[in-house]
């Protein structure tokens, strides 16, 4: 079975660590996918380790574990995340993670700031 | 540098059968499924069989089940595809290719022209 | 078994054009979608993987978009070398299968 937080928050420009956690007494793991909606984010294998598709180089980094840390994020950056855990003899399991990203609380503040300054 | 040398092409009857060999070098060959794709003259590109890095997982195009069987030696680091029953239908170059991850095709070998005919 | 529909399956156009490619999928395919460009003699070259993602060392004006049924392979600015068939090919599931190609040719 796949054990994720189904519901998670993260603050535009900072990062956040997608996880899932798969559990079983007798497949083992042999890849690991991991999407933006649609869109690949990137891939681990046994074989092969981990491979970051390139739209995403620059703001994905693998780990910890089999999750990955999205950094820079910005407010397109909310949506569905999609675990794929291939297991042999076991098969495939899926997981989901939505995300969403906030205005970081320095914005609101400023804003807030901003906008009760005097004007004179 | 990836390198993928296929060899073993020629001219053969129909009926008759051929071995192609891929020669793998400059990556852990036995990390990496391996496939065969095949070009007709003029045509596109076709796939014909993949197996995966420790042989367990293979398949085959419907056109070429029951004749072609693929195979490979890790440890000697070449791919291999045993074609019987050939068929006229059958004359393409043939390439073998990398697949990491099974999802996308990152090298190819030059290729070897099979041609069946009488 | 998955279909997949090139269109055009050839165009002329001029150096500097912006040229666009697209491939359309029997079923859902997610984005286990690649491009490669094939010119004469020589083996296919990968440009694009998973739909979107550019392959180490290809020019940053190919580019790919598209996800579920329907791909968009776009040459943002055509150069000589350019000149060659593309093909999109899905993987989600075997048996592997390729678009029909399409030739750019010299305007």
């Known amino acids: 079975t796949i054990d994720t937080k189904r519901n998670i928050s993260a603050e535009e420009g900072g990062s956040v660590i997608l996880q899932c956690h798969f559990s079983s007494d007798t497949a083992e793991v042999t890849q690991v996918d991991w999407k933006q909606q649609d869109q690949l984010l990137a891939i681990y294998s046994v074989d092969l380790g981990w491979h970051v598709a390139s739209v995403f180089s620059d703001r994905v980094v693998p780990g910890p574990s089999l999750g990955l840390t999205f950094q820079s994020l910005t407010m397109n950056d909310t949506g569905e995340y999609f675990c794929t855990y291939h297991t042999y003899p076991g098969g495939i399991y899926k997981g989901r993670i939505f995300l969403k990203v906030q205005e970081s609380s320095d914005d609101r503040n400023g804003l807030a700031q901003f906008q009760t300054a005097p004007l004179g | 540098e990836v390198q993928l040398l296929e060899s073993g092409g020629g001219l053969v009857q129909p009926g008759g059968s051929l071995r192609l060999s891929c020669a793998a070098s400059?990556?852990?060959?036995?990390?990496?499924?391996m496939h065969w794709v095949r070009q007709a003259p003029g045509k596109g590109l076709e796939w014909v069989s993949s197996?995966?890095?420790?042989?367990?997982?293979?398949s085959y195009a419907d056109s070429v089940k029951g004749r072609f069987t693929i195979s490979r030696d890790n440890s000697k680091n070449t791919l291999y595809l045993q074609m019987n029953s050939l068929r006229a239908e059958d004359t393409a170059v043939y390439y073998c290719?990398?697949?990491?991850?099974?999802?996308?095709?990152?090298?190819w070998g030059q290729g070897t022209l099979v041609t069946v005919s009488s | 078994d998955i279909q997949m529909t090139q269109s055009p399956s050839s165009l002329s156009a001029s150096v500097g054009d912006r040229v666009t490619i697209t491939c359309r999928a029997s079923?859902?395919?997610?984005?286990?979608l690649n491009w490669y460009q094939q010119k004469p003699g020589k083996a296919p070259k990968l440009l694009i993987y998973?739909?979107?993602s550019l392959q180490s060392g290809v020019p940053s004006r190919f580019s790919g978009s598209g996800s579920g049924t329907d791909f968009t392979l776009t040459i943002s600015s055509l150069q000589p070398e350019d000149f060659a068939t593309y093909y999109c090919?899905?993987?989600?599931?075997?048996?592997?299968?390729f678009g029909g190609g399409t030739k750019v040719e010299i305007k």
């Open positions: 290719a990398r697949v990491p991850y099974d999802y996308w095709i990152d090298y």
């Open positions: 400059g990556f852990t060959f036995s990390s990496y499924s």
């Open positions: 197996i995966n890095s420790n042989a367990g997982t293979i």
């Open positions: 079923q859902s395919i997610s984005s286990y």
């Open positions: 998973a739909a979107s």
């Open positions: 090919q899905q993987s989600y599931s075997t048996p592997l299968t």
